[in-house]
Amino acid sequence: FKVATPYSLYVCPEGQNVTLTCRLLGPVDKGHDVTFYKTWYRSSRGEVQTCSERRPIRNLTFQDLHLHHGGHQAANTSHDLAQRHGLESASDHHGNFSITMRNLTLLDSGLYCCLVVEIRHHHSEHRVHGAMELQVQTGKDAPSNCVVYPSSSQESENITAHHHHHHH
């Protein structure tokens, strides 16, 4: 299996909500002896490998933000802890999984990584990750809504319909 990142760059104004997305691709064994551990963390573009370093997202570690279930089962973090930090990770039946960040600030800018660990009984684990950049902007140059740039081409896409400003 592989992990695809539909968008490699998200450019958002301060105060906006955004959902970063990854997708599980390829043959996903739905047998009882296979489960998937999915999580999110911040990282840096290392010289050797992107996403090798695991940093917290808003002080929450990858341990706090994980999802665990079979291949295409739905799941989401119900932890109050994550929601108190304006975060929620979720997964659907189609292999998509995401993290939603509410009320973005400039401090949220950086590289985000999704990680999938395939746990197959009596086999070694198989780890795959995806990376995407989040740029939070303020001032007159900031977009009015989040703009996303597909991984395959740099054609931008406005995601106004899906993400709304955080109202105080």
Epitope: Y37, V48, Q63, H66, V117, I119, H122, S124
Partner: antibody, heavy 118, light 107 residues
Framework: QVQLVESGGGLVKPGGSLRLSCAAS????????MSWIRQAPGKGLEWVSY????????YYADSVKGRFTISRDNAKNSLYLQMNSLRAEDTAVYYC???????????WGRGTLVTVSS | EIVLTQSPATLSLSPGERATLSCRAS??????LAWYQQKPGQAPRLLIY???NRATGIPARFSASGSGTDFTLTISSLEPEDFAVYYC?????????FGQGTKVEIK
């Protein structure tokens, strides 16, 4: 921060049994994949057994297979190691540790000493 | 099982000196290797994960490198609290295995 505390160690004769417990403080123990690791006096670390957050799969080191049984009770935030047919070479400090997928032993208890001697 | 061999068994150094510890795997473990520090009477503490990344709260004087079968842990300038036993551990395959340890002692 979650803490792990082992108990149940002690002196036991060869061939005897002992049940170790590992109590976790905090509300997320059911998310934890766990292992038991032991350390003989003055020696190195040896992984003993693993259990996933749901209780399956379970793995054992060859040295304890058929004699030790790992289990957990998520409602009680507890991990267990039932040790039967104990041998002198099982003498060690036994640690419980968190063992998340794609990760390492990042959270350890303080250990409990098991001494097998006649 | 994958055997991890650490060298040297003991390293005698003074505070301020550089320590270089080695861990060699009997077969490739990719970058799925960790380093732990253990002080007398204490449980081990995760220092390095995935061969080269410092765990949370670990000082910058600790660095590590390697992949495949050869790995190195370096302490750039030894502090008094760094004298301890260091273990490498792989999670590429079952069973999880540890090296036999390197003791860093005060000269």
């Amino acid at each position: 921060q979650v803490q792990l505390v082992e108990s149940g160690g002690g002196l036991v004769k060869p061939g005897g049994s002992l049940r170790l417990s590992c109590a976790a403080s905090g509300e997320t123990f059911s998310d934890y994949y766990m292992s038991w690791i032991r350390q003989a006096p003055g020696k190195g670390l040896e992984w003993v057994s693993y259990i996933s957050n749901s209780g399956s799969p379970i793995y054992y080191a060859d040295s304890v297979k058929g004699r030790f049984t790992i289990s957990r009770d998520n409602a009680k935030n507890s991990l267990y190691l039932q040790m039967n047919s104990l041998r002198a070479e099982d003498t060690a400090v036994y640690y419980c540790a968190r063992d998340l997928p794609g990760w390492y032993f990042d959270l350890w208890g303080r250990g409990t000493l098991v001494t097998v001697s006649s | 099982e994958i055997v991890l061999t650490q060298s040297p068994a003991t390293l005698s150094l003074s505070p301020g000196e550089r320590a270089t510890l080695s861990c060699r795997a009997s077969q490739s473990v990719s970058s799925y290797l960790a380093w732990y520090q253990q002080k007398p009477g204490q449980a081990p503490r995760l220092l390095i994960y995935d061969a080269s990344n410092r765990a949370t709260g670990i000082p910058a004087r600790f660095s590590a490198s390697g992949s495949g079968t050869d790995f190195t842990l370096t302490i750039s300038s030894l502090e008094p609290e760094d004298f301890a036993v260091y273990y490498c551990q792989q999670r590429n395959n079952w069973p999880r295995t540890f090296g036999q340890g390197t003791k860093v002692e005060i000269k």
